[in-house]
């Protein structure tokens, strides 16, 4: 079943290569287990950036060695992606799945365009 997911259109990463955005979903039921996946779309290729699963009211558990961190509050997930470089500029899509209890719902946001600018190297000081 489809579910609406909202996320900002554009985010600019900071000078340390960190970008944060909120992924909000319109929960049709009372989900107790939620899964969030961040996908990156570039040149019509979609790759998984990170994935987290959590019980409502608990911390997000990011799977594998993740470059993402995050927190949840109600139907909002605050996502932070670290270690970004200019080459990582692209569209980052938030996918939310309500895993438990049935029925299963899935929603995909329109994506957040994250712009990353590599910092200029500091000039040598004499």
């Amino acid at each position: 079943k489809a579910m609406h997911v909202a996320q900002p259109a554009v985010v600019l990463a900071n000078s340390r290569g960190t970008a944060s955005f909120v992924c909000e979903y319109a929960s049709p039921g009372k989900a107790t287990e939620v899964r969030v996946t961040v996908l990156r779309q570039a040149d019509s290729q979609v790759t998984e950036v990170c994935a987290a699963t959590y019980m409502m009211g608990n911390e997000l558990t990011f799977l594998d060695d993740s470059i993402c961190t995050g927190t949840s509050s109600g139907n909002q997930v605050n996502l932070t992606i670290q270690g970004l470089r200019a080459m990582d500029t692209g569209l980052y899509i938030c996918k939310v799945e309500l895993m438990y209890p049935p029925p299963y719902y899935m929603g995909i946001g329109n994506g957040t365009q994250i712009y990353v600018i590599d910092p200029e190297p500091c000039p040598d000081s004499d």
Epitope: T32, E48, E97, Y100, P101, Y104
Partner: antibody, heavy 123, light 107 residues
């Protein structure tokens, strides 16, 4: 001990419908999801769908939406699957299975299976 | 849908040997994988879940491993009762699909 007792083998005519049952015992029926599987020599094992007996919430595999209807009766600790408009493609062994934990992250597993119900569709 | 591929449809081995059965997912399933054993005319029985956790009462000669898209089930020192079919199943996104199975036969 946990037991899932499925109904007996069925021989049905094409176009007919059949209802399979799965009686659970040895645990609290409403504490665990009940899933249904189909097994054929050609397509192997396929996941049909899941029902939460507590809430009645259901998720179907899109492939079986409109073909299978899942229900659960809390008073008799029995799950049912109705299969509609049967064709030869529906001839298979059907299993009810219990998911091994109620909504705990990572506990995704079918820990108990019924003995299976053989359905043969033939005129 | 995620496609689970067990490339080896059948393999034969002798009692006492060690065998490894593999399963590949079409996308990262983050260890959300179970292995089942099925004997002829019987229902599947749980062996391993979360890719590497043994089910209750499963002998320690069975072990699961893998990550991402590649997973395997290893059986050390095969016993006569280990012969049958083995299936993997993912639990990432619905529908929760199975591999086509690997039939383990006595050599």
């Amino acid at each position: 001990q946990v037991k899932l007792q499925e109904s007996g083998a069925e021989l049905v005519r094409p176009g007919a419908s059949v209802t399979l049952s799965c009686k659970a015992s040895g645990y609290t029926f409403t504490d665990y999801e009940m899933h249904w599987m189909k097994q054929t020599p050609v397509h192997g094992l396929e996941w049909i769908g899941v029902i939460d007996p507590e809430t009645g919430g259901i998720t179907y595999n899109q492939k079986f939406k409109g073909k299978a209807t899942l229900t659960a009766d809390k008073s008799s600790s029995t799950a049912y699957m109705e299969f509609l408009s049967l064709t030869s493609e529906d001839s298979a062994v059907y299993y009810c299975t219990r998911r091994g934990a109620r909504a705990t992250v990572y506990n995704y597993v079918m820990d108990y299976w019924g003995q299976g119900t053989s359905v043969t569709v033939s005129s | 849908d995620i496609v689970m591929t067990q490339t080896t449809a059948s393999l034969s081995a002798s009692v006492g040997e060690t065998v490894t059965i593999t399963c590949r997912a079409s996308e990262n399933i983050h260890n959300y994988l179970a292995w089942y054993q099925q004997k002829q005319g019987r229902s599947p029985q749980l062996l391993v879940y979360n890719a590497k956790t043994l089910g209750d009462g499963v002998p320690s000669r069975f072990s699961g491993s893998g990550s991402g898209t590649q997973y395997s089930l290893k059986i050390n020192s095969l016993q006569p009762e280990d012969f049958g079919s083995y299936y993997c199943q993912h639990f990432w996104s619905t529908p929760w699909t199975f591999g086509g199975g690997t039939k383990l036969e006595i050599k």
